[in-house]
């Protein structure tokens, strides 16, 4: 006995629906047909679908799936993209402020050094920016270059102000002597340690965020397999062939199909979880010498200390270096000890410490909290997509891929699918090459995040002190502890506040011959939704 004809004996409803997908009706039968050429929507009787319609449904199903996936990841994608941009800009602003603090220190304390010092400071902070963005620069080389460049100017302008300009031909010799004699004490090493640790962490933080974007972009633009396309077509469109336009797929059936389609994507889950937890660990450790904001904004103070160290030993140094690195016309070696007054602007430089409402560190923690709400993103994707596409509630009166059923049974559905394609096989195929690649990248960044030499919790504060940061003793040589916290000493108390009122914000471009003081650009402020205020150390 033949099966009953479809409810719409004329395929009228099917035609009008299909026309929305594909203008023109040439592929839609006017009345039900046997459909022996169909490969996906295998008919139990006459059908309102043709092979061409089936192909169109498959294409549409895969496009729908891509759109659903993109809308599923939209919030997460926006979160990471926005934060990556905000942090990148924030770090650039920190670098710019750090450069300005340092220039202001030279301008206020060592005006005779300013034209050259501004240039060297500018080059140093340019390298800092490039390093953060991933450039292959060695941090120790950057710091050495800064001090190598500064010392000849300090020597010729401050320690030997009578030397002719041509004395700069002894730069090579002076650079050798400055390091052989450790003329800046351990300050260059201290700066190397602080800057390399904080920049390394900053750089990997940005790298990790950018990889997060890449992961989402990769899974966002996955092209689903033909097998998946067939499964989706059966779930979403095969019911139409029978004229069942209003029937929704069973929820359980949708989950089975989605798990099959997304088996490869779900493999990212383990590494994605690890990525978020490793990133959290990194962020928790980003304080003191691992916090670039803290380190860079205090650099001017350490550089100031290092020049004071040279000044303290100026008498002995001038004699020793004067003999080795004299200008070729200058035969006598003056041993002039220049008093402090020559070196130090006697203005007392104080900084008001204002508690800030929001800093980069709180912003980082906030990001981690939001990211943690997406920790199960990949494992939850199949369920998410089913809940955001039309499915029948309670699995009653729903489409199971073959027919309308009162109650969905997974076993029956699986049995019904066996002849057409094997769901298990689909799962066993393994992830797409692009997914494998992104998994490899996640493994790599997770390894990097884990192996970062970061303090594990606040217990290590003592050890950080021993490294010389903000500590009472400045290494083996007590003599290096000049002006540690006395009058005239500049200390930036902790983080930058982003409502900038930098009175002295002089950019290197304006600085050399220009006492005008530029103010930070307005867009710098708006970017941060008012993350507090910047307080200049130099008023």
């Amino acid at each position: 006995q033949p099966p009953p004809p479809p409810p719409d004996a004329t395929c009228h409803q099917v035609r009008s629906f299909f026309q929305r997908l594909q203008p023109g009706l040439k592929w839609v039968p006017e009345t039900p047909v046997p459909g022996s050429d169909l490969q996906v929507c295998l008919p139990k009787g006459p059908t309102c679908c043709s092979r061409k319609m089936e192909e169109k449904y498959q294409l549409t199903a895969r496009l729908n799936m891509e759109q659903l996936l993109q809308s599923a990841s939209m919030e997460l994608k926006f979160l990471i993209i926005q934060n990556a941009a905000v942090f990148q800009e924030a770090f650039e602003i920190v670098v710019r402020h750090a450069k300005n603090y340092t220039n202001a220190m030279f301008k206020n304390n060592y005006p005779s050094l300013t034209p050259q010092a501004f240039e060297f400071v500018g080059e140093f902070f340019t390298d800092v920016s490039l390093y953060i963005l991933g450039s292959d620069i060695n941090v120790d080389d950057m710091v050495n270059e800064l001090f190598d460049s500064l010392f000849p100017v300090i020597y010729t302008q401050l320690m030997n102000p009578g030397l002719p300009d041509s004395a700069l031909d002894i730069n090579e010799c002076l650079r050798g002597a400055r390091r052989d004699l450790k003329v800046f004490g351990n300050f260059p090493k201290l700066i190397m340690t602080q800057v390399s640790k904080s920049l390394q962490v900053t750089r990997i933080f940005l790298q990790a965020l950018n990889l997060g974007i890449e992961v989402i972009n990769t899974t966002d633009h996955l092209k689903f397999s033909k097998d998946c396309g067939r499964m989706l077509t059966r779930m979403w469109y095969c019911s139409y062939c029978q004229g069942l336009m209003m029937v929704k797929p069973c929820g359980g059936y949708c989950n089975v199909v989605m798990q099959g389609c997304m088996a490869g994507v779900v493999e990212i889950d383990k590494y994605w979880r690890e990525y978020i937890l490793s990133l959290e660990e990194l962020v928790n450790g980003m304080y003191r010498i691992y916090d670039m904001e803290n380190v860079l904004l205090g650099l001017f103070s350490t550089i100031h200390d290092s020049i004071q160290y040279v000044q303290k030993n100026a008498g002995k140094l001038t004699t020793t270096i004067g003999k080795l690195c004299a200008h070729s016309q200058q035969r006598q070696y003056r041993s002039a000890y220049y008093p402090e007054d020559l070196f130090i602007d006697k203005k007392v430089l104080k900084v008001a410490h204002v508690e800030h409402e929001e800093t980069l560190s709180s912003r980082r923690r906030e990001l981690i909290q939001k990211l943690k709400s997406f920790i199960s993103f990949y494992s939850a994707l199949p369920g998410y997509i089913c809940s955001h596409s039309p499915v029948a509630e309670n699995d009653t009166l729903c489409w199971n891929g073959q027919e309308l059923v009162e109650r969905y049974s997974q076993k029956a559905a699986r049995n019904g699918m066996k002849n057409q394609f094997n769901l298990h096989e689909l799962k066993m195929k393994g992830p797409e090459p692009v997914v494998s690649q992104i998994i490899d990248k996640l493994k790599h960044i997770n390894q990097l995040l884990r192996t970062m030499s970061m303090p594990k919790g606040r217990v290590l504060d003592k050890n950080l002190d021993e490294e010389g940061f903000e500590s009472g003793d400045c290494g083996d040589d007590e003599d290096e502890c000049i002006g540690g916290s006395g009058d005239g000493m500049i200390k930036v108390k902790n983080q930058l506040r982003f409502l900038a009122e930098l009175a002295y914000d002089l950019d290197v471009d304006d600085a050399p011959g220009n006492s005008q003081q530029a103010t930070p650009k307005d867009n710098e402020i708006s970017t941060f939704h008012n993350l507090g205020n910047v307080h200049s150390p130099l008023k």
Epitope: K323, A326, R331
Partner: antibody, heavy 116, light 108 residues
Framework: QVQLVQSGGGLVHPGGSLRLSCAGS????????MHWVRQAPGKGLEWVSA???????YYADSVKGRFTISRDNAKNSLYLQMNSLRAEDTAVYYC??????????WGQGTLVTVSS | SYVLTQPPSVSVAPGKTARITCGGN??????VHWYQQKPGQAPVLVIY???DRPSGIPERFSGSNSGNTATLTISRVEAGDEADYYC???????????FGGGTKLTVL
């Protein structure tokens, strides 16, 4: 590239004199301090003398008063005048330049033999 | 005057790590340079200012300096590393440049 070419070594009797020369090329000679370092047969390196960019001189205690270091920036040349030579001065003598990487370039060495 | 003390010899198997020490009173306050010398050749700078490496010197060579000891470390030692190694400092108080006695590195 940086080159230091030495000449002037040879055999000399105890109490005799010898003048070593070292010609620099491939760098701004006047910007670097220069050194003489020697190595007795089968022994280690021993610093002998140095001269600063402006002509300031330095000597090891073992050669002070007998050896004189000098330079001629116009000729890109370094010299070591060795007087009152002794058997223990027998060695390969190297000239070397001193700059931002300390003593970073060496001559090929020249053998001085003091023997009767 | 200032004295630098090195062990006369160090032996190491290929692929292992060799450590050559250089002792001196408060040497950590000075900058230490290391030279490699192969038979019949002029010395070559391998580490300068405690830990910097000139271009062309493999990353396997590294240096450290603190307290009374400076150390040259050669990781993953190769047969071609067999040579004499000298440490050197400038003792500015006596205006002398000082070399250590040298260490012969033998690769087993």
């Amino acid at each position: 590239q940086v080159q230091l070419v030495q000449s002037g070594g040879g055999l000399v009797h105890p109490g005799g004199s010898l003048r070593l020369s070292c010609a620099g090329s491939g760098f701004t000679f006047s910007s670097y301090a220069m050194h003489w370092v020697r190595q007795a047969p089968g022994k280690g390196l021993e610093w002998v003398s140095a001269i600063g960019t402006g002509g300031g001189t330095y000597y090891a205690d073992s050669v002070k008063g007998r050896f004189t270091i000098s330079r001629d920036n116009a000729k890109n040349s370094l010299y070591l005048q060795m007087n009152s030579l002794r058997a223990e001065d027998t060695a390969v003598y190297y000239c070397a330049r001193y700059g931002r990487k300390s003593i970073d370039a060496w001559g090929q060495g020249t053998l001085v033999t003091v023997s009767s | 005057s200032y004295v630098l003390t090195q062990p006369p010899s160090v032996s190491v198997a290929p692929g292992k790590t060799a450590r050559i020490t250089c002792g001196g009173n408060n040497i950590g306050s000075k900058s230490v340079h290391w030279y490699q010398q192969k038979p019949g050749q002029a010395p070559v700078l391998v580490i300068y200012y405690d830990s910097d490496r000139p271009s062309g010197i493999p990353e396997r060579f590294s240096g450290s300096n603190s307290g009374n000891t400076a150390t040259l470390t050669i990781s993953r030692v190769e047969a071609g590393d067999e040579a004499d190694y000298y440490c050197q400092v400038w003792d500015s108080s006596s205006d002398h440049w000082v070399f250590g006695g040298g260490t012969k590195l033998t690769v087993l």
